[in-house]
Amino acid sequence: ESALITQQDLAPQQRAAPQQKRSSPSEGLCPPGHHISEDGRDCISCKYGQDYSTHWNDLLFCLRCTRCDSGEVELSPCTTTRNTVCQCEEGTFREEDSPEMCRKCRTGCPRGMVKVGDCTPWSDIECVHKESGTKHSGEVPAVEETVTSSPGTPASPCSLSG
């Protein structure tokens, strides 16, 4: 199943929550790292490394931990209160419109353009026209037109889901 559910997707009704941890729900909610039991009378802990919950909630199950795909590196592991944080490997990036896969960064800009931004895990290299300074559309140029450059190093991690 390609659809990724996060607790934000499932939690339209955010309610102010009490601060102390309890084994039974407080005001009908269970703390992060737990889900509510079928009868609504207990809070059941999520399984470390398998599932998680990030907010006070009345979900009847915890959310599955994301597994990083090949081509991704794991920046931080899944805990009972936080999903795995995955990041594209060096030289690749993830676009907002195609978040399901890491794409290779271009190796250079087309002729007549200069590189103003490095490859990061969340963006391709950025090219602008020498004269006008306007950005290039992002089409991959023909090989003979490219001016080679090395991929940049990641500046900061990008989180895929809450």
Epitope: E1, A3, I5, D9, L10, Q13, S24, P25, E27, G28, I36, E38, D39, G40, R41, D51, N57, D58, L59, L60, F61, R64
Partner: antibody
């Protein structure tokens, strides 16, 4: 719009099994529980259990545990209810019905299938 | 299991007149979280049940405001302020406070 379309009527012999399907459309299939409820002729409604398409968990009414198996095919957004060791008292209309993943709003069914009549007769 | 008892079994009413259906549970339906999980469905002839009211008094989307629910503890009521022809069918109450969830036996509303 949300639609739950069930398979056609079935006639079965005592001791046999029946498998009823429920095809969902108009919403994210993995975003809701799929419940099964039955209604015997002239009788009330009886909740049998529910399936969680997100993680594959099942939760059954103890009365049916061991005799009912709930499954889904996520690729076709279809839920299935299989009832085994059929007896005449299992003659009923079987409904699939959707409910939310939250305790506070998960105990009522906002959309129902049209029902599938299962007749158990020798 | 919690037993849900509905009265009357059958309710003949005149068009435009009010109607009232009672539902009584064998145990309190007040959950430890303070909420009461009592719901009402209408099953029109030849159709599947449709949700009318959830959690005692909340009308489901598209349900006319002539339908209202009330009650607490073990005693609950569904009221129709002015019965219309399309309101004919069997009304069921159900509870989800206690597992397994259970339904009442139904009340058949018909036009006199």
């Amino acid at each position: 719009q949300v639609q739950l379309v069930q398979s056609g009527a079935e006639v079965k012999k005592p001791g046999a099994s029946v498998k009823v399907s429920c095809k969902a459309s108009g919403y994210s299939f993995i975003g809701y529980f799929m419940n099964w409820v039955r209604q015997a002729p002239g009788m009330g409604l009886e909740w049998m259990g529910r399936f969680n398409p997100y993680n594959g968990d099942t939760f059954y009414n103890q009365k049916f545990k061991g005799r009912v198996t709930l499954t889904v095919d996520k690729s076709t957004s279809t839920a299935y209810m299989e009832l085994s060791s059929l007896r005449s008292e299992d003659t009923a209309v079987y409904y699939c019905a959707r409910s939310a993943y939250y305790f506070d709003s998960g105990g009522y069914f906002d959309y129902w299938g049209q029902g599938t009549l299962v007749t158990v007769s020798s | 299991d919690v037993v849900m008892t509905q009265t009357p079994l059958s309710l003949p009413v005149s068009l435009g007149e009010p109607a009232s259906i009672s539902c009584r549970s064998s145990q309190s339906l007040v959950h430890s979280n303070g909420n009461t999980y009592l719901h009402w469905y209408l099953q029109k002839p030849g159709q599947s049940p449709k949700l009318l009211i959830y959690k005692v008094s909340n009308r489901f989307s598209g349900v006319p405001d002539r339908f209202s629910g009330s009650g607490s503890g073990t005693d609950f009521t569904l009221k129709i302020s002015r019965v219309e022809a399309e309101d004919v069918g069997v009304y069921f109450c159900s509870q989800s406070t206690h597992v397994p969830w259970t339904f009442g036996g139904g009340t058949k509303v018909e036009i006199k």
